[in-house]
């Protein structure tokens, strides 16, 4: 089943994926689309990147994080209620069959009406963010997205990258989980 | 320490061509992207494109294709900007810069004049 | 293409005074890939800040950057006479890649 992201009007919605590049000089193409993973590709791009860059996108849809490095989160600004759904990211490992793909539910609730200021979440991720290697744990807790032959040190810089950033405070308010194996 | 070493200025007739270098230095040439950019006097920069000298692989602004041709000689560290049918739009100053753009060539002058 | 627009194009700041340069982007781009650079007549650009905010080898810490998605700014905490140049910011993660027409920072 896919994994559940939430977000309100008007907000930025964030859609996380992550794989581990083999070479700096080597990326593999990523491809965003709205709607499940079909066998191949990904249906209705948002978003592409190639060897080196984000070769298509459409506005309000982008990569905030170091795609360089293996982040390839999609962000999506200024939600609304038709943003609702399932989106497919799609690690286009070479090779035949060897593509990862990720299915993830954007799920956008209305705005809230808020009597008084309150700290705004500009993104927000319903359910806990969980790292897994390939292959281990059940498929709804693979929410980061393909890390093929990640090693413990890898993990774990990723999880100090992960309280260091932006998102510390959210991901600290949603219980963000680093699960190994 | 990291350098990037361009030719000097080039005072060419209209309708030539050109081949601007750039030689690097202090770091493993195959390795890392060259961008080129372009500078028009008083104006702001334009990339051109980069090659990755591992590959030969090349990316151009669309603005570019047909005006510029990358190249690289990996034997001597050499990155190589090939600029046809010149006209005075091309008269400009070229950076070569590095990777991630955290180095820049010096800069090479081309005035297109009759 | 992406357009990165800056603003203001020209502006003079007295010594000791607060400066913000913005450089605005017509969709969103990698706050990894968005950079500053600092430019003086007959010289080559100099990367100023790197990754929206990391200065530099050698900038001085009066100068930070910050921002996101597409809206990214620069700031000069007290301009001081050296900090006269034409400042640029640049996106390299969107193809092909991008430069703001500038900004001419003059002293008073």
């Known amino acids: 089943s896919e994994v559940e992201y939430r977000a309100e009007v008007g907000q930025n919605a964030y859609l996380p994926c992550f794989y581990t590049p083999a070479a700096p000089g080597n990326l593999v193409p990523v491809c965003w689309g709205k709607g499940a993973c079909p066998v191949f590709e990904c249906g209705n791009v948002v978003l592409r990147t190639d060897e080196r860059d984000v070769n298509y996108w459409t506005s309000r849809y982008w990569l905030n994080g170091d795609f360089r490095k293996g982040d390839v989160s999609l962000t999506i600004e200024n939600v609304t209620l038709a943003d609702s759904g399932i989106y497919c990211c799609r690690i286009q490992i070479p090779g035949i069959m060897n593509d990862e793909k990720f299915n993830l539910k954007l799920v956008i609730k209305p705005a809230k009406v808020t009597p008084a200021p309150t700290r705004q979440r500009d993104f927000t991720a319903a359910f806990p963010r969980m790292l897994t290697t390939r292959g281990h744990g059940p498929a709804e807790t693979q929410t980061l997205g393909s890390l093929p032959d990640i090693n413990l040190t890898q993990i774990s810089t990723l999880a100090n990258e992960l309280r260091d950033s932006r998102l510390a405070n959210d991901l600290r308010d949603s219980g963000a989980t680093i699960r190994i194996g | 320490q990291i350098q990037l070493q361009q030719s000097g200025p080039e005072l060419v007739t209209p309708g030539t061509s050109v081949k601007i270098s750039c030689k690097a230095s202090?770091?493993?040439?195959?390795?890392?992207?060259i961008n080129w950019v372009k500078q028009r006097p008083g104006q702001g920069l334009e990339w051109i494109g980069w090659?990755?000298?591992?590959?030969?692989?090349?990316k151009y602004n669309e603005k570019f294709k047909g005006k510029a041709t990358l190249t690289v000689d990996t034997s001597s560290s050499i990155a190589y900007m090939h600029l046809s049918s010149l006209t005075s739009e091309d008269s400009a100053v070229y950076f070569c810069?590095?990777?991630?753009?955290?180095?820049w060539g010096q800069g090479t002058t081309l005035t297109v004049s009759s | 293409q992406i357009v990165l627009t800056q603003s203001p194009a020209i502006m003079s700041a007295s010594p000791g005074e607060k400066v913000t340069l913005t450089c605005s982007a017509s969709?969103?781009?990698?706050?990894?890939?968005l950079y500053w650079y600092q430019q003086k007549p007959g010289s080559s650009p100099k990367l100023w800040i790197y990754?929206?905010?990391n200065l530099a080898s050698g900038v001085p810490a009066r100068f930070s950057g910050s921002g996101s998605g597409t809206s990214y700014s620069l700031t000069i905490s007290n301009m001081e006479t050296e900090d006269a140049a034409s400042y640029f910011c640049h996106q390299w993660s969107n193809s092909p890649y991008t430069f703001g027409g500038g900004t001419k920072l003059e002293i008073k």
């Open positions: 810069a590095g990777d991630r753009f955290d180095y």
């Open positions: 202090g770091y493993t040439f195959t390795d890392y992207y």
């Open positions: 090659i990755y000298p591992g590959s030969g692989n090349t």
């Open positions: 990754s929206t905010s």
């Open positions: 969709s969103g781009v990698s706050s990894s890939y």
